[in-house]
């Protein structure tokens, strides 16, 4: 979380940006809060990235005023007009691209005043890992796959009855590069499981956490999924 | 001087419409949102709902999603609230207030009676 | 909807004392807090917005406090045109919400 605060002439108001990610092919949400001003008209929003030249996003009068926008967000950014009225000046970032990873300043001017933060947004691709029963394999046999993770994750497999254990010996990880030669699929399989007993594959890096979680008894297999983005910190 | 002028008293049938007209300064209208809070006899403030004729954007509390239509006419710097499908519950005073996110003016008030 | 409570519901005060009255939040507003005077008959007025800021020509002795789901407002030494209900209102997300209101009365 950070917290940027106004400087000189008018009282600086506070505006409050949380650190993110993005998932590379889909839209993402750069988060950036303000306090709410009545008078709607004053209300100009602008978005900027560190390195770029153009302006990011820029909302003034109560519409987007995009003649000084860069062109590397084109058609791809939004705020969302009903919820400026609440403070809320996020940004919505349509087909994430790689190089819009960076340092991104939130500037508002209200008629209160002027206030700015800056916001950390990583890129990467991250998603849900499945686990299933390996029927084709000559033992037991667990299959985690996850379809899209850059950049390359660790995998690492745990077990409920035998907390603590390196199953790295019985387990193998690949990684197959995607058609847009970007991301890539995860696959690990993971041998010798015994029955009554709960697996996870935990896949990760430094934008996001995963666990496919699966139980298998002799009537029943139970499956759970699970996503975390990390450093998703406020300034 | 911010006025906010509202249309008088009503008294309506159970299942008909209602609407309340409020009429502000030009410089209000471009500026500000416009919202729409009632109070039943002896009860609390209610918001019902709000439009920002500068974000083109409207907003209803879910309670009246679906009966509550505000609009607003720029021409006129007019905003409308109509409330359909009425009941003796809808029974109250209705004021336009200047804002959201909070309201700094207030219309009048306009008593609405739903009754048979 | 963030739903909010205001306490107590009514509150019996001599002129020239100090009142001071709650409104509670069921989730964060940070400071996105407002209240509202009304009188019998009358529309209800702005007092306080950001939590602590007055609005225009409201006195000093009218003041506003708190952050998150907490707030206050202080009327110190009460005159006998503060005799009135007080609402609070949340505007951190919609719906804005309002409190069920304090009826401030002279003791």
């Known amino acids: 979380l950070i917290i940027g605060f106004g400087i000189s002439g008018r009282h600086s108001i506070t505006v409050t940006t949380v650190a993110s990610a993005g998932n590379i092919g889909e839209d993402g949400i750069l988060s950036c809060t303000f306090e709410p001003d009545i008078k709607l008209s004053d209300i100009v929003i602008q978005w900027l990235k560190e390195g770029v030249l153009g302006l990011v996003h820029e909302f003034k009068e109560g519409k987007d005023e995009l003649s000084e926008q860069d062109e590397m967000f084109r058609g791809r950014t939004a705020v969302f007009a009903d919820q400026v009225i609440v403070g809320n000046a996020s940004l919505r970032l349509k087909n994430v691209q790689l190089t819009d990873a960076g340092t991104y300043k939130c500037y508002i001017i209200t008629s209160k005043g002027k206030g700015n933060a800056n916001l950390e947004y990583k890129t990467g691709a991250f998603s849900m890992p499945e686990v299933n029963v390996d029927y084709n394999a000559s033992s037991e046999t667990l299959r985690c796959e996850a379809p899209r993770w850059f950049p390359q994750p660790t995998v690492v497999w745990a077990s409920q009855v035998d907390q603590g254990a390196n199953f790295s010996e019985v387990s193998n990880t690949s990684f197959e590069l995607n058609s847009e030669n970007v991301t890539m699929k995860v696959v690990s399989v993971l041998y010798n499981v015994t029955i009554n007993n709960t697996y996870s594959c935990m896949i990760e890096n430094d934008i996001a956490k995963a666990t496919g979680d699966i139980k298998v008894t002799e009537s029943e297999i139970k499956r759970r999924s699970h996503l975390q983005l990390l450093n998703s910190k406020a300034s | 001087q911010v006025q906010l002028v509202q249309s008088g008293a009503e008294v309506k049938k159970p299942g008909s419409s209602m609407r309340v007209s409020c009429k502000a300064s030009?410089?209000?209208?471009?500026?500000?949102?416009i919202s729409w809070v009632r109070q039943a006899p002896g009860q609390g403030l209610e918001w019902m709902g709000g439009t920002a004729p500068i974000f083109g954007t409207t907003n209803y509390a879910q309670k009246f999603q679906g009966r509550v239509t505000i609009t607003a006419d720029k021409s006129t710097s007019t905003a409308y609230m109509e409330l359909s499908s009425l009941r003796s519950e809808d029974t109250a005073v209705y004021y336009c207030?200047?804002?959201?996110?909070?309201?700094?003016?207030w219309g009048q008030g306009t008593l609405v009676t739903v009754s048979s | 909807e963030i739903v909010m409570t205001q306490s107590p519901a009514s509150l019996s005060v001599s002129p020239g004392e100090r009142a001071t009255l709650s409104c509670r939040a069921s989730?964060?507003?940070?400071?996105?807090l407002a209240w509202y005077q009304q009188k019998p008959g009358q529309a209800p007025r702005l007092l306080i917005y950001g939590a602590s800021t007055r609005a225009t020509g409201i006195p000093a002795r009218v003041s506003g406090g708190g952050s998150g789901t907490e707030f206050t407002l202080t009327i110190s030494s009460l005159q006998s045109e503060d005799f009135a209900v007080y609402y609070c209102?949340?505007?951190?997300?919609?719906?804005?919400?309002f409190g069920p209101g304090t009826k401030l009365e002279i003791k």
């Open positions: 030009e410089d209000t209208f471009s500026s500000y949102a």
């Open positions: 989730q964060s507003v940070s400071s996105n």
């Open positions: 209102q949340q505007y951190k997300n919609w719906p804005f919400t």
């Open positions: 207030a200047r804002g959201g996110p909070y309201f700094d003016y």
